[in-house]
């Protein structure tokens, strides 16, 4: 077994976790995750790593002479998902009644609140980490008198006598005491898009604003796509 | 709770060597480096280098290069610090410290103290 | 190597106090981190990140800072606060610590 640094057989390559210096004309040792070269190797030495500095990182086997730098701590609508350390990025996701508007290679660089549906419109198809909210306007004998990313347009109840009929953003007022309904009362809530990831964190000092990220989008209400029909 | 547990105090000649032992208890080693602190009688704290039990490595302070070795053994969970050619100004109590991945040292061992007294 | 210098190297307050511990680093650095020793112990994790304080560690601690000067405040001084306080960065190899800062209390 040939030790590093060791010359390849002519039209041969290196090993696993070795790489080639074209300088050397050697097979000389990668350094490993959380590592970078400080020293590259000679026709007599082979390389020398040390540790990532504090916020960067090598997530894998590598010869780079300076490890990567963590990104930018997580906005203030994001969470972090994992922590930047010596082996891995930091990861920012959207926090829940948010969405990713623009994902990168992991995580999330830009965040937009999920669009609210208004009186008068539901939910038909809910947000997810990815895509926002669609509306879609209440059918006739449904309604939804709420401004919310989760309800859906829900049935009128059913009365014996109507004192007013009921529209796409109000229920029906009966006169009789005893209402029958098609559906259980009280509004009907899909769930919130939550992050797949668990992964326990420590904290970050997170920026009193957003930098250059979610002015870009509004960060109150959306306004709903009241002319969609849902798909 | 995790938990580093050094081995006792030493008392060695000058030119001699020391190996101090740390075992680690309650996690998993290989997913900790271990680093070696040492603080010398009423002075501050030193860093004198790191091992990476995952992949073998380690990274000394450049002015113990050469006279300092850390080892590890998976298969116990421990962690060795090898120090030779023993000064009078080596002696000290030396701490194993883990930084799970980051960079500051959030498990400290119970230290050992190491006297160097001819 | 980065040097931290902290000052005072010596403290003696009274409880109640408001007190300020400084570590100036001898180039900028990203994050400080900071530790508790009292006396025949190891050093304990204080803050970390700058600002964050470690599991346990009281709220009357707080730190701040950025590039090269950094501070440790206690907003309240309490008897069990008396010990050596030490600085440390890893923004560049190797580590390395200030010179402590030991509080007394009056």
């Known amino acids: 077994v040939a030790f590093t640094p060791y010359a390849p057989e002519p039209g041969g390559t290196c090993r696993l976790r070795e790489y080639y210096d074209q300088t050397a004309q050697m097979c000389c040792s990668k350094c490993p995750p959380g590592q970078h070269a400080k020293v590259f190797c000679t026709k007599t030495s082979d390389t020398v790593c040390d540790s990532c500095e504090d916020s960067t990182y090598t997530q894998l086997w590598n010869w780079v002479p300076e490890c990567l730098s963590c990104g930018s701590r997580c906005s203030s609508d994001q969470v972090e998902t994992q922590a930047c350390t010596r082996e891995q990025n930091r990861i920012c996701t959207c926090r829940p009644g948010w969405y990713c508007a623009l994902s990168k290679q992991e995580g999330c660089r830009l965040c937009a609140q999920l669009r609210k549906c208004r009186p008068g419109f539901g939910v038909a198809r809910p947000g997810t980490e990815t895509s926002d909210v669609v509306c879609k306007p209440c059918a006739p004998g449904t309604f939804s008198n709420t401004t919310s990313s989760t309800d859906i347009c829900r049935p009128h109840q059913i009365c014996h006598v109507v004192a007013i009929p009921g529209n796409a953003s109000m229920d029906a007022v009966c006169t009789s005491t005893s209402p029958t309904r098609s559906m259980a009362p009280g509004a009907v809530h899909l769930p919130q898009p939550v992050s797949t990831r668990s992964q326990h964190t420590q904290p970050t000092p997170a920026p009193s604003t957003a930098p250059g990220t979610s002015f870009l989008l509004p960060v109150g209400p959306s306004p709903p796509a009241e002319g969609s029909t849902g798909d | 709770q995790v938990q580093l547990v050094q081995s006792g105090a030493e008392l060695k000649k000058p030119g001699a060597s020391v190996k101090v032992s740390c075992k680690a208890s309650?996690?998993?080693?290989?997913?900790?480096?271990m680093n070696w602190v040492r603080q010398a009688p009423g002075q501050s704290l030193e860093w004198m280098g790191i091992?990476?039990?995952?992949?073998?490595?380690?990274s000394y302070a450049q002015k113990l290069q050469g006279r300092v070795t850390l080892t590890t053994d998976t298969s116990t969970s421990t962690a060795y610090m090898e120090l030779r050619s023993l000064r009078s100004d080596d002696t000290a109590v030396y701490y194993c410290?883990?930084?799970?991945?980051?960079?500051?040292?959030?498990?400290w061992g119970t230290g050992t103290t190491v006297t160097v007294s001819s | 190597d980065i040097q931290l210098t902290q000052s005072p190297s010596f403290l003696s307050a009274s409880v109640g106090d408001r007190v300020t511990i400084t570590c100036r680093a001898s180039?900028?650095?990203?994050?400080m981190y900071w530790y508790q020793q009292k006396p025949g112990k190891a050093p304990k994790p204080w803050i970390y990140?700058?600002?964050n304080l470690a599991s346990g560690v009281p709220s009357r601690f707080s730190g701040s800072g950025s590039g090269t000067e950094y501070t440790l405040t206690i907003s309240s001084l309490q008897p069990e606060d008396a010990a050596t306080y030490y600085c440390?960065?890893?923004?560049?190899?190797?580590?390395?610590f200030g010179s402590g800062t030991k509080l007394e209390i009056k």
């Open positions: 410290a883990t930084d799970g991945g980051t960079w500051y040292f959030d498990v």
């Open positions: 309650s996690y998993s080693f290989t997913d900790y480096n």
């Open positions: 091992i990476f039990p995952k992949y073998g490595t380690t």
């Open positions: 180039s900028s650095v990203t994050y």
């Open positions: 990140l700058t600002s």
């Open positions: 440390q960065q890893w923004s560049s190899n190797p580590p390395t």
